[in-house]
C-alpha cells in the first residue's frame, strides 16, 4: 500500500517546541531576517484560483446552482451577480497571464455543479466538461502542470437542499462518485489532486459562524459533524485513487489544510505556549492530526469537545490515517479574518509562515509540503500598483526559503494566491487578491499584471532572491591622508575651569569641627598656576574617549548662542572661545584634527542667540549678516588650528522647525544658503590664504529607492525626493547657483493646479554668483535608504509639496528607530553626487545607526563594517575622491535613540574596538596588501604620508 512508504514518525507531535526554541536571533545576521539564496532545483512554482471566485457564468451553459450562488442571493449584499473575472469565458486571457508569470503549475478547482448540476454523477454537463478539457490541454501544451482541487466550497445547491449538505453522511459517497468521474476523465493529464480546500473554513464559517455558504450558524455539533464528514469523504477518495487510479496514473493526492499562526504573549511562559499549541491544534490539528498524525482528533479536542465531536472507531482511524501523499498547506487572510475565525486563547496572532512550517515539520514528522495557497489582500480600489502586496509576498516567500534552507523543512512547491482578482467570499468584491487586476465593470475583463505579478515573475525567473544592489566585499585601503573621524553634536562650553585648585592660593582643611565644611588655614599661601585646558572636566573626558576611539579627526559643533549671547560682536564670551580652543589644541596634541561646525541646529533647539531667534531667526535676512560676524570671529580665533570647517549642519532639515508653511521653510533655507555663501566668500578671501583650510556645509543625504520598482511614478518619486532633499542645496552650491529646475517646476505646477500655494524664492543675479561654487567639498550626513512612493498631497507644506510617502520594507534589517541598514545606498548616493555635481572631494560627515545594546552593540559594528565597505568601493572602484569618514556619534543623549559609541554616562561600547581596527588597518587590507602609507612608493603627495616617512 502506498501509504506504507510514509516516513512520518514520532507521534504525538512536538510542534510546541517551536515556541521554546528561542534561537536568540542575532540582530545582524541578515540571513535571519532576509535570506539571499535560491530555492531547490526544480522547485514547483505555481499560482491558484478557486472556481467560484473566478469562473463567473453562474448559470450559463447548463451549470447548476451552488451553495454560494444561493448564499449571495440570500445573505450577501452584492450589487452584481456577474462581477467576477469570467474565467469560463476568458480562458485564453488566463493562459496568457500564466505565460507571463512563468509558473510551473496552475492550481484551479473544478466546479462540481458545472459538471453535475444536481450533484449526482449522471451525464456530465457537456459545456462544463469541454471547458475543463480545454483548460487542461492548454496547460499541458504550455508545460504547465495542473494541480486540481475537486472541492473549493461550491457544493451543488441541490445537495444542500436535499441532504442538508455536509451535515449528511450521504455526501461522502456522492463526493467519491464525483471524484471518481474526475479521475477517470481528467486523471491521464493530472498528476496532483487536492480533494478539499481548507475544510476547516467550510465547517467553521459554513455551519458555525454563518459567514460562508450555506450560512448556518449556532449549532456547534453541526460544525464538528461537517468536519467529520469532510475528513471521511477525503479519506474515501484517497483510498479510491490509491487503489484504482494511482497504479496507472501515477499521481499524488492530498487535502489543503489552512491555518493561522500564533505567538505566546510571554515567550518564557509554559502556560502561554500551551495555549498557542491548543490554538494551532484546534484549527490545523483538527484535520491534520487524523490525516498526518495518529488517525484521531487531537487530544485537546477530544477532551474538550466530548459531547459534540464525533468519535473515530479504530478501523476509521486506520482508514483516515496517512491519507495524504504530501502536506498541502494554506496560509492566507481567510484563516486570519474576521477575528472569530480562530481561537486565539488570548495569545498574539502572527503572520510568521516560517514558524508555522516549522510547527508542521515538528508536529507531523517533517512531511513534504506544498504551500497550496499563500498571499494577502489589498483594498478593492487598488489597481495594478499593489506595493504592499509585493512586500507581503517577498516576506512570505523568504520565510519559505528560510524554512527550507535554514530549518530543513521539506517544502517542494508554492502557490501564490491568486492569479486573478475575483469574488472574495464574505468580502465579496471589497478586497482583491489577484496578481492580475481585473476591472469587473469592463466588458472584456482584461487581466493587467499588478506589481506583485512582475515581482513573482522575477522570483520565479531567478528561482529565489538575488542581492542585485550589493557588490561583494572588497579588500583594500583608503588613501594615506584619509580622515577617520567621529562626530559629536554641539559641545556646550564650560563657563569656568571645573577646579579652583590652581587659582585659589589658600589651604583648606575639611571637616575640622565635624561639620563637613572646608576651613581656611590662615597664614598659609600656596603657589598658583595659570589655568590649563585640562582643567575643563568635559575636555578631559572627551580626550579620554577620543583617545580610545583612535580617530584622526573629531567633528564637533560650536554653540553660537554661547559664543555670542547677544547675537552680535558687542558681547563676546571669551571663556567659551577659550574652551573651544582648548578642545582643539588638546586634540591636536593627540594627533586628532578638528572639523568644526559653526552652526548645528537641532529639532528641539534652533541654537541661535536669543535676540536673533526673537527677531525671526532664519526668516529674517539680517540673521545672515550676524552669522557672517560670528563666523569671522571663529575663523580669527580658531582658524590657525582648524583646517576643515562646516558652516551649517543639515540646513535641509531645518524644514522640521520652520514648518508653519512651505514658504517659511523655503525662505529660511534661502537665507541659510545665502548666509553660508557669504561666510564661504569671507573665508575664501580673508582667511584661506593664510589658514589654508576648506569649508562646506553638511547635508542630510539619505538615499531613496522606489518602494515599488515596477511603477514609474515611484522611480520619479525617488528622484523627486533627492531633488527636494539634497539637490535643493547642492544644485545652487555645486552647479547652477539656483534651485533645481525639477523642484521649481514641480512646485509651480502644483501651485497652478491649486494643490499648493508654495513659491520657491528667486536668487538675484548677485546672489546667484555668490552661491554658485561656494563650497569646497561635499559633506554628506548619510544614515539610511528610504523607500518612497508617489502620493499626491494637498496643502502648503514642504513635506506635502514633494508628493512623497515613505514605506518600510519589513524584510530589511533595521534599527530600533526603523532606520533600514542598506549600505549600497551610500554608494549610489556618492555616485549620484559625482554624476550630478562633479568630481569634488567628499567627506561622509556623519554615518551611524541607533543600537539598543548598552555594551555589545553588534548592529552598530555590522553597520560600520558595511557602510565603510561601501565607502571603500566608492574610492577603489568608482574613483570617488573620498577623503574622510566620520562615524556618528561619540556619545549618546539621554532618552534619545542610542547612536553613541559611549553611553550618556560615558561607558564604552564594543563597537569602539571594531572601529579601532578599521582605523588601524585603514580599511580592509588583504593579507599581502599593496604598499602601506608609511612605505616609500613613487612620490606620495599627501602631508600625512610625508610626515610618516
Amino acid at each position: 500500500d502506498y501509504k506504507d512508504d510514509d516516513d512520518k514518525l514520532d507521534f504525538p507531535g512536538d510542534g510546541r517546541a517551536v515556541w521554546s526554541q528561542n534561537p536568540n536571533l542575532s540582530p545582524v545576521n541578515e540571513s535571519q531576517l532576509f535570506l539571499y539564496d535560491t530555492f531547490p532545483k526544480n522547485f514547483f512554482w505555481g499560482v491558484g484560483t478557486g472556481a467560484f471566485q473566478v469562473e463567473g457564468s453562474w448559470k450559463k451553459d447548463g451549470k447548476g446552482l451552488s451553495v454560494w450562488d444561493h448564499f449571495i442571493a440570500t445573505h450577501l449584499n452584492v450589487s452584481s451577480r456577474d462581477g467576477s473575472s469570467d474565467s469560463y469565458i476568458f480562458l485564453e486571457k488566463d493562459l496568457s497571464a500564466l505565460d507571463f508569470l512563468g509558473v510551473s503549475f496552475y492550481q484551479f478547482s473544478i466546479s462540481w455543479p458545472r459538471l453535475f448540476p444536481d450533484g449526482t454523477v449522471a451525464v456530465a454537463n457537456a459545456k462544463g466538461l469541454q471547458y475543463y478539457n480545454r483548460l487542461l490541454d492548454s496547460l499541458l501544451l504550455r508545460n504547465i502542470e495542473p494541480v486540481v482541487t475537486l472541492y473549493h466550497w461550491d457544493l451543488p445547491w441541490a445537495l444542500q437542499e436535499k441532504y442538508g449538505g455536509w451535515k449528511n453522511e450521504t455526501l461522502i459517497d456522492l463526493f467519491n462518485d464525483y471524484a471518481t468521474y474526475c479521475f477517470q476523465t481528467f486523471g491521464d493529464r493530472v498528476k496532483y489532486w487536492i480533494t478539499i480546500h481548507n475544510p476547516y473554513l467550510v465547517a467553521w464559517h459554513g455551519y458555525g459562524t454563518g459567514l460562508h455558504a450555506p450560512g448556518e450558524k449556532g449549532n456547534v455539533a453541526a460544525v464538528y459533524t461537517v468536519g467529520h464528514n469532510l475528513l471521511k469523504a477525503h479519506s474515501k477518495v484517497w483510498h479510491n485513487y490509491n487503489r484504482n487510479f494511482r497504479p496507472h496514473q501515477k499521481g499524488w493526492l492530498s487535502i489543503t489544510l489552512g491555518s493561522h499562526w500564533i505567538e505566546p504573549n510571554r515567550a518564557e511562559s509554559i502556560v502561554d505556549i500551551l495555549k498557542c499549541q491548543q490554538s494551532m491544534v484546534s484549527v490545523l490539528g483538527w484535520f491534520a492530526n487524523p490525516i498526518h498524525g495518529d488517525g484521531d482528533y487531537p487530544e485537546v479536542m477530544t477532551k474538550k469537545l466530548l459531547s459534540v465531536l464525533p468519535a473515530f472507531s479504530e478501523a476509521e482511524k486506520n482508514e483516515v490515517r496517512g491519507t495524504a501523499d504530501f502536506f498541502a498547506f494554506s496560509f492566507g487572510p481567510n484563516n486570519f479574518k474576521p477575528l472569530n475565525t480562530m481561537a486565539k486563547m488570548g495569545q498574539n496572532v502572527s503572520l510568521n509562515l516560517r514558524q508555522v512550517l516549522n510547527w508542521i515539520k515538528l508536529e507531523y514528522g517533517n512531511p513534504r509540503i506544498l504551500i497550496a495557497e499563500n498571499g494577502w489582500f489589498t483594498d478593492s480600489y487598488v489597481q495594478t500598483e499593489d506595493t504592499t502586496a509585493i512586500y507581503m509576498m517577498k516576506n512570505f516567500l523568504n520565510q519559505v526559503l528560510q524554512a527550507i534552507r535554514l530549518d530543513g523543512v521539506r517544502v517542494f512547491g508554492y502557490t501564490a494566491w491568486s492569479l486573478l482578482d475575483g469574488f472574495e467570499w464574505q468580502d465579496a468584491y471589497n478586497t482583491r487578491r489577484g496578481l492580475f487586476y481585473v476591472d469587473f465593470n469592463s466588458e472584456q475583463r482584461e487581466r493587467r499584471p499588478k506589481s506583485s505579478a512582475h515581482y513573482y515573475k522575477q522570483v520565479i525567473g531567478e528561482n529565489g532572491f538575488t542581492l542585485r544592489e550589493a557588490t561583494p566585499d572588497l579588500q583594500g585601503q583608503f588613501p594615506c591622508d584619509f580622515s577617520w573621524g567621529v562626530t559629536e553634536s554641539v559641545l556646550k562650553p564650560e563657563s569656568v575651569a571645573s577646579s579652583p585648585q590652581f587659582s585659589d592660593p589658600h589651604l583648606y582643611v575639611w571637616n575640622a569641627t565635624g561639620n563637613r565644611m572646608l576651613h581656611r588655614v590662615e597664614g598659609v599661601r600656596l603657589k598658583t598656576r595659570p589655568a590649563q585646558c585640562t582643567d575643563f572636566i568635559t575636555i578631559k573626558k572627551q580626550l579620554e574617549m577620543l583617545a580610545r576611539m583612535k580617530v584622526t579627526h573629531f567633528r564637533f559643533a560650536l554653540d553660537w548662542a554661547s559664543v555670542l549671547p547677544t547675537g552680535n560682536l558687542s558681547e563676546v564670551n571669551r571663556q567659551a572661545l577659550r574652551y573651544y580652543r582648548c578642545v582643539v589644541t588638546e586634540g591636536l596634541k593627540l594627533n586628532i584634527s578638528p572639523m568644526v561646525t559653526l552652526y548645528y541646529p537641532t529639532h528641539a533647539h534652533l541654537g541661535l542667540p536669543a535676540p536673533l531667534l526673537h527677531s525671526g531667526g532664519w526668516l529674517d535676512p539680517s540673521t545672515a549678516k550676524a552669522f557672517r560676524d560670528y563666523a569671522g570671529l571663529c575663523f580669527r580665533e580658531l582658524g590657525d588650528l582648524v583646517k576643515l570647517w562646516i558652516t551649517i549642519n543639515e540646513p535641509n532639515r531645518l524644514s522640521d522647525v520652520y514648518n508653519r508653511t512651505s514658504n517659511d521653510t523655503y525662505q529660511a533655507a534661502h537665507n541659510l544658503l545665502i548666509a553660508h555663501a557669504i561666510v564661504w566668500h569671507l573665508y575664501d578671501r580673508q582667511y584661506r590664504p593664510s589658514q589654508r583650510g576648506a569649508l562646506s556645509l553638511s547635508l542630510h543625504s539619505d538615499w531613496a529607492e522606489p518602494a515599488n520598482p515596477y511603477v514609474a511614478s515611484h522611480w520619479q518619486a525617488a528622484e523627486r525626493f533627492l531633488q527636494f532633499e539634497i539637490a535643493w542645496f547642492a544644485e545652487p552650491l555645486f552647479k547652477t547657483g539656483d534651485y533645481p529646475v525639477a523642484m521649481r517646476e514641480y512646485i509651480a505646477s502644483k501651485t497652478r493646479r491649486g494643490l499648493s500655494s508654495s513659491v520657491l524664492p528667486r536668487f538675484s543675479d548677485a546672489e546667484r554668483r555668490l552661491v554658485k561654487g561656494a563650497a569646497d567639498f561635499y559633506a554628506l550626513n548619510h544614515f539610511t535608504t528610504r523607500f518612497v512612493m508617489h502620493e499626491q498631497q494637498n496643502g502648503s507644506r514642504y513635506d506635502s509639496d514633494r508628493d512623497v510617502q515613505f514605506l518600510q520594507d519589513i524584510t530589511r534589517l533595521a534599527s530600533p528607530s526603523r532606520l533600514a541598514v542598506m549600505p549600497w545606498g551610500e554608494g549610489k548616493l556618492l555616485r549620484w553626487m559625482r554624476n550630478n555635481y562633479g568630481d569634488l572631494d567628499v567627506y561622509i560627515t556623519a554615518n551611524g545607526i541607533d543600537d539598543q545594546a548598552l555594551q555589545n552593540d553588534q548592529l552598530r559594528q555590522y553597520y560600520l563594517e558595511k557602510y565603510v565597505q561601501e565607502a571603500l568601493k566608492a574610492y577603489l572602484i568608482d574613483k570617488i575622491k573620498i577623503k574622510g569618514y566620520y562615524a556618528f556619534k561619540l556619545t549618546e543623549e539621554k532618552s534619545k535613540p542610542r547612536f553613541g559609541f559611549f553611553t550618556s554616562d560615558f561607558k564604552a561600547k564594543s563597537s569602539i574596538q571594531f572601529y579601532n581596527k578599521l582605523i588601524t588597518s585603514n580599511g580592509f587590507p588583504s593579507e599581502n596588501g599593496g604598499p602601506r602609507c608609511n612605505q616609500t612608493q613613487g612620490n606620495p603627495e599627501c602631508t600625512v604620508c610625508l610626515l610618516l616617512l
Epitope: 542585485r468 544592489e469 557588490t471 594615506c480 604598499p931 613613487g938 599627501c942
Partner: antibody, heavy 116, light 107 residues
Framework: EVKFLESGGGLVQPGGSLRLSCAVS????????MSWVRQAPGKGLEWIGE????????NYTPSLKDKFVISRDNAKNTLYLQMSKVRSADTALYYC?????????WGQGTLVTVSA | DIVMTQSPATLSVTPGDRVSLSCRAS??????VYWYQQKSHESPRLLII???QSISGIPSRFSGSGSGSDFTLSINSVEPEDVGVYYC?????????FGGGTKLEIK
C-alpha cells in the same frame, strides 16, 4: 586642454626591460587615479593596472603582476610602467588613461615591440 | 577573473538601422559596465558609464541598458562615422576586463 602623452616604447629583446612614461597636462594629476591599458596588434584591449593618487593602492591584472610595476611622480605629473621579463606576447600599443571610474581620457599610445 | 563575452563579433549594417550590441558577464556585476568605441588608428573613446548613463558630448543615438550579467549597447540610427570596434568593460571586480569587441561595419 587635457593631454596624455606616452613615451618610451620601441624595440626590446625577449627577457629585457623597458620603462614607459606618460606625461599628463590639463588636469590636476595628483588628484586622480591613473591606468595602463594595452592592445596587441589587431586584438582587443587588455587592462594592465591602476594606481591611486597617493600611490598607496596599486591594482594589477594578476597575470602581469610579477613583471610590470606601475608608479607615478606627482611632482612631475608623470605616470610610469616598468616592464621586465618581456616576451613576444607583450608586443602591443600601450595606452595610459584616467579611470574615473571608466577610462575617460586616453593617450595616443606608445608601441612596444618584443623581438629578437 | 570576470569574462566579458561580446556578440556578435562582427555586425554589418545599413545607415539608419537600429543596432544592438550584446555583452555578457560571467557573473553578476550590477551595473558596472562601461562601453567604448574605437575607430581605426585611434584611441578608444568612452560612450556609456554604469551600463546606461550617457556621457556628455556623445551623440544621443548611443544608449545602454542592462544590469546583472546581460548588457546591451544600442545605436538608434547608425551613421557612417559609427564604424569601428565597440568594447564593453567590467568595472566591478579587479582586473577590469574588456570584452573581445564587436566590429561594426557599413554594408
Amino acid at each position: 586642454e587635457v593631454k596624455f602623452l606616452e613615451s618610451g616604447g620601441g624595440l626590446v629583446q625577449p627577457g629585457g626591460s623597458l620603462r614607459l612614461s606618460c606625461a599628463v597636462s590639463g588636469i590636476d594629476f595628483s588628484r586622480y587615479w591613473m591606468s595602463w591599458v594595452r592592445q596587441a596588434p589587431g586584438k582587443g584591449l587588455e587592462w594592465i593596472g591602476e594606481i591611486s593618487p597617493d600611490s598607496s593602492t596599486i591594482n594589477y591584472t594578476p597575470s602581469l603582476k610579477d613583471k610590470f610595476v606601475i608608479s607615478r611622480d606627482n611632482a612631475k605629473n608623470t605616470l610610469y610602467l616598468q616592464m621586465s621579463k618581456v616576451r613576444s606576447a607583450d608586443t602591443a600599443l600601450y595606452y595610459c588613461a584616467r579611470p574615473s571610474p571608466a577610462l575617460d581620457y586616453w593617450g595616443q599610445g606608445t608601441l612596444v615591440t618584443v623581438s629578437a | 577573473d570576470i569574462v566579458m563575452t561580446q556578440s556578435p563579433a562582427t555586425l554589418s549594417v545599413t545607415p539608419g538601422d537600429r543596432v544592438s550590441l550584446s555583452c555578457r558577464a560571467s557573473q553578476s556585476i550590477s551595473d558596472y559596465v562601461y562601453w567604448y568605441q574605437q575607430k581605426s588608428h585611434e584611441s578608444p573613446r568612452l560612450l556609456i558609464i554604469y551600463a546606461s548613463q550617457s556621457i556628455s558630448g556623445i551623440p544621443s543615438r548611443f544608449s545602454g541598458s542592462g544590469s546583472g550579467s546581460d548588457f546591451t549597447l544600442s545605436i538608434n540610427s547608425v551613421e557612417p562615422e559609427d564604424v569601428g570596434v565597440y568594447y564593453c568593460q567590467n568595472g566591478h571586480n579587479f582586473p577590469y576586463t574588456f570584452g573581445g569587441g564587436t566590429k561594426l561595419e557599413i554594408k
